[in-house]
């Protein structure tokens, strides 16, 4: 949960307010209380955002882009509060706002700089392209341009491809990393410096498991304590890769503590889940169960991917029958 907006105090009657795209914010302004209050909010010294005088709003010449998006704290005006409540900010709203307040005793002008950030939750994906394996860190909508860093076994990697698409109001970013043939662990961090928000994706490849047909396999999936906070909503998904695409076996939602299982031979231990251990069992293995199994633990702040490779071999009985 993030605050409505946060203020950075800077000198000369100027404040910086940082808001999130499509959320509501408050542009702060205060004055020494007095009678005959006049309040004019303007954008970039040109566009009328909100006017209040003679005890009521006067929005006849308000710029259309602010229609139905602004209001004052009317019960607080007599206490010296001229702050503007601003609904559904967009990136086009970024800029300098001036609050003019006149009373019977003085006139004051406050400047507020509005910066708007976007950070739709990024994702880390594991993809197979022909014989190559890729990890892709991507964020569908982000502003300003984020800082993306990769680590391999906790060591920063200088190679960092970034595929960037700019739209009118934000960037869409993909950062792919070729991990073909690697058993290392990888970490991708995407940081939005404006919103002071960081997301981390972590990928771990477990040792391959060899099982016989009809046996069961237990695949571990435990979050790394550095990232995992049980108080935060998260989702756990187990899926299996077949023919280059993943099919979901089961998932768990922490918010509702709901478990949905799509594969009858899949089982989760409820007691272990309560201890934040999302290891799973797959019973009665058959040859077609060979492949890669992916555990994905995701929240707003991280994605933890754990890959298991399972090889199912024919049992001696089956082999002798052939």
């Amino acid at each position: 949960i993030f605050p409505l907006a946060f203020f950075i105090y800077v000198p000369m009657n100027e404040q910086i307010v940082i808001g999130r795209l499509d959320e509501d914010i408050i542009l702060p302004s205060s004055f020494e209380r007095g009678s005959e209050v006049v309040i004019h909010w303007k954008y970039q010294d040109s566009y009328k955002v909100h006017s209040y005088y003679k005890g009521s709003d006067h929005l006849e010449s308000q710029d259309p882009r602010y229609a139905n998006r602004t209001s004052l704290f009317y019960n607080e005006i007599q206490n010296g509060n001229a702050s503007l409540f601003f609904r559904r900010v967009s990136l086009l709203d970024e800029g300098i706002y001036t609050c003019y307040v006149g009373t019977a005793i003085q006139v004051i002008t406050n400047k507020v700089v509005l910066k708007v950030g976007v950070f739709l939750t990024p994702v880390m994906k594991y993809e197979k392209r022909n014989t190559n394996s890729f990890l892709i860190c991507s964020v569908l909508s982000v502003y300003p341009r984020p800082i993306i860093t990769w680590k391999m076994d906790n060591t920063p990697i200088s190679e960092n491809n970034m595929e960037e698409t700019g739209s009118l109001d934000s960037f869409s970013i993909n950062s792919p990393l070729n991990i073909t043939g690697s058993n290392s662990s990888y970490e991708c961090t995407i940081e939005n410096s404006l919103l002071k928000q960081t997301w981390t994706g972590r990928w771990t490849m477990k040792d391959g498991l060899h099982k016989m047909q009809s046996e069961h396999v237990s695949l571990s999936c435990q979050p790394v304590n550095d990232y995992f906070s049980p108080n935060q909503d998260f989702k756990v998904t187990w899926s299996r890769m077949k023919s280059g695409t993943f099919s979901v076996l089961a998932y768990y939602l922490s918010s509702s503590q709901n478990t949905i299982i799509n594969e009858s031979r899949f089982s989760w231990n409820k007691e272990l889940i309560n201890q934040s251990d999302f290891s799973m069992n797959l019973m009665d293995l058959n040859l077609s169960d060979s492949g890669e199994y992916l555990c994905n633990i995701s929240s707003d702040e991280y994605t933890l991917l754990t890959i298991h490779t399972v090889h199912v071999e024919p049992s001696q009985e089956t082999a002798s029958h052939n």
């Epitope: 005088y53 006149g102 006139v107």
Partner: antibody, heavy 121, light 107 residues
Framework: QVQLVESGGGVVQPGRSLRLSCAAS????????IHWVRQAPGKGLEWVAV????????YYADSVRGRFTISRDNSKNTLSLQMNSLRVEDTAVYYC??????????????WGQGTLVTVSS | DIQMTQSPSTLSASVGDRVTITCRAS??????LAWYQQKPGKAPKLLIY???SLESGVPSRFSGSGSGTEFTLTISSLQPDDLATYYC?????????FGQGTKLEIK
């Protein structure tokens, strides 16, 4: 202290033009709306026009709309009233007067001494 | 436009008298009314704003009251210096309009 000094008055023929000025001092000019108010000889007061602190809004009395134009130069602390198509009934002392604040309130806290405009053939 | 009507047009009173001037608006103007004093040959001076608020520096013998359409300016104890014409003005809406004035004479 607040001072407003009007100038530019004089005798002019009907149909001609005249430009009045108002020089302000003793306050932050760009913070306040300024009005023109006139008074015909021996008569009452009549509001003429207002310009807001940032010149974003200008309003005129019906009797002068389309003929008079109010403007300001905040860098020079001056207010102007361009009067075109003057009529005999525009004869008056013209006062510039400072609004309580932005110009939105509409009453007059400080007044200049006035400048006389006489429209006569 | 909103019409403002003052009464009386002329008023003669003695020093020390309590004097009342009335102003009526042609439609409701809430409390958006100001009173001015104009001495001969001088610019007007603001006395009262918002119907009853005394402007800074104005003697406390001046007071205003009323709301809606009926307003009064009262001088509690008339002084020789109060010889002037008094105007009411509505600032509820453009165009701002004045009353025709009340000339106050000292007996």
């Amino acid at each position: 202290q607040v001072q407003l000094v009007e100038s530019g008055g004089g005798v002019v023929q009907p149909g001609r033009s005249l430009r009045l000025s108002c020089a302000a001092s003793g306050f932050t000019f760009s913070d306040y709306g300024i009005h023109w108010v006139r008074q015909a000889p021996g008569k009452g007061l009549e509001w003429v026009a207002v310009i807001w602190y940032d010149a974003s809004d200008k309003y005129y009395a019906d009797s002068v709309r389309g003929r008079f134009t109010i403007s300001r130069d905040n860098s020079k602390n001056t207010l102007s009233l361009q009067m075109n198509s003057l009529r005999v009934e525009d004869t008056a002392v013209y006062y510039c007067a400072r609004d309580r604040s932005s110009g939105a309130m509409g009453y007059f806290v400080y007044w200049g001494q006035g400048t006389l405009v006489t429209v006569s053939s | 436009d909103i019409q403002m009507t003052q009464s009386p047009s002329t008023l003669s009173a003695s020093v020390g008298d309590r004097v009342t001037i009335t102003c009526r608006a042609s439609q409701s103007i809430s409390s958006w009314l100001a009173w001015y004093q104009q001495k001969p040959g001088k610019a007007p001076k603001l006395l009262i704003y918002k119907a009853s608020s005394l402007e800074s520096g104005v003697p406390s013998r001046f007071s205003g009251s009323g709301s809606g359409t009926e307003f009064t300016l009262t001088i509690s104890s008339l002084q020789p210096d109060d010889l002037a014409t008094y105007y009411c003005q509505q600032y509820n809406s453009y165009s701002y309009t004045f009353g025709q004035g009340t000339k106050l004479e000292i007996k």
